[in-house]
């Protein structure tokens, strides 16, 4: 039975040209995290594998940095980066847990972080 929950940074905003950290945290389970995939809509951004380490998709290499931890740092943000991001935790023996983050990239300098929330 899958008992874990994914806590994410939730709805967040950031300034154009700036950077942002996307973070997810898996709790309430003793399952082993074998891999975390980061996706933006229908694009694979990066993968962190327990054995192989990080793989950043070549088309994002200039603007995506691994970490901190299992998170992902997006740099040189543009308005086109606005949208949904997903952290997909592959675990053993539980299976797959998915967290969602919505990022809004703002033209103005008023960019506030949203509240944290949980996805079961």
């Amino acid at each position: 039975m899958m008992t874990g929950t994914i806590e994410t940074t939730g709805n967040i905003s950031a300034e154009k040209g700036g950077s942002i950290i996307l973070q997810c945290h898996l709790s309430s389970t003793t399952a082993q995290v074998t891999q975390v995939n980061w996706e933006q809509q229908d694009q694979l951004l990066a993968i962190c594998n327990a054995d192989l380490g990080w793989h950043i998709s070549p088309s994002f290499k200039d603007r995506v940095a691994p970490g901190p931890g299992l998170g992902l740092t997006l740099q040189s943000l543009t308005v086109n980066d606005t949208g949904e991001y997903f952290c997909i935790y592959h675990t053993y023996p539980d299976g797959t847990y998915t967290g969602r983050i919505f990022l809004e990239v703002l033209e103005s300098s008023v960019a506030e972080h949203g509240a944290r929330f949980q996805i079961p």
Partner: antibody, heavy 118, light 107 residues
Framework: EVQLLESGGGLVQPGGSLRLSCAAS????????MSWVRQAPGKGLEWVAS????????YYADSVKGRFTISRDNSKNTLYLQMNSLRAEDTAVYYC???????????WGQGTLVTVSS | DIQMTQSPSSLSASVGDRVTITCRAS??????LNWYQQKPGKAPKLLIY???SLQSGVPSRFSGSGSGTDFTLTISSLQPEDFATYYC?????????FGGGTKVEIK
Amino acid sequence: EVQLLESGGGLVQPGGSLRLSCAASGFTFSSYAMSWVRQAPGKGLEWVASIKSNTGSTYYADSVKGRFTISRDNSKNTLYLQMNSLRAEDTAVYYCAREPYSVWLDYWGQGTLVTVSS
Amino acid sequence: DIQMTQSPSSLSASVGDRVTITCRASQSISSYLNWYQQKPGKAPKLLIYAASSLQSGVPSRFSGSGSGTDFTLTISSLQPEDFATYYCQQSYSTPLTFGGGTKVEIK
């Protein structure tokens, strides 16, 4: 240089068994998921089975489930496919392949031919 | 199971031609789509992974695009060594499934 070398193929009667091996070199075998893929004569590619690196979890195509067993010996850098209750439709070239991040198959062996016939 | 449908099943083209092969998944597979090239009697060779990432050592005339259910492999200028069969493959979920293949022949 990454190398995968399959062996163990041959002619076997229906209902018989074979054990295929895939010797890996040139990379840290224990860190990678591995797969077997087969190709019947003149046909397309068909995935057979996969095994994960860190957990040893195994996955099978419905067509071989209960008959084939994928395993690995990380100390010997070798992948195996135990094939039991073989059928004529299992006749194919069997390839082993490395599966980084369980997303793509980046290196393939040269293949070994399994022929099931009476 | 996710079904992968490739088209066309075969095509004839000349050296220098631009060639496009399409692959459609029966459900959304995000960008978990790979392309392989296979020549007679040889093992498949990875060309493109994760829909659009060019595998190391593969010529830049090969490119991939698409996401969700519809994907494309493009050869910008066909070379003599490109005459082969091409397969798409989804890795979104097991069982891993391949398209039926597209044979690229000399016109």
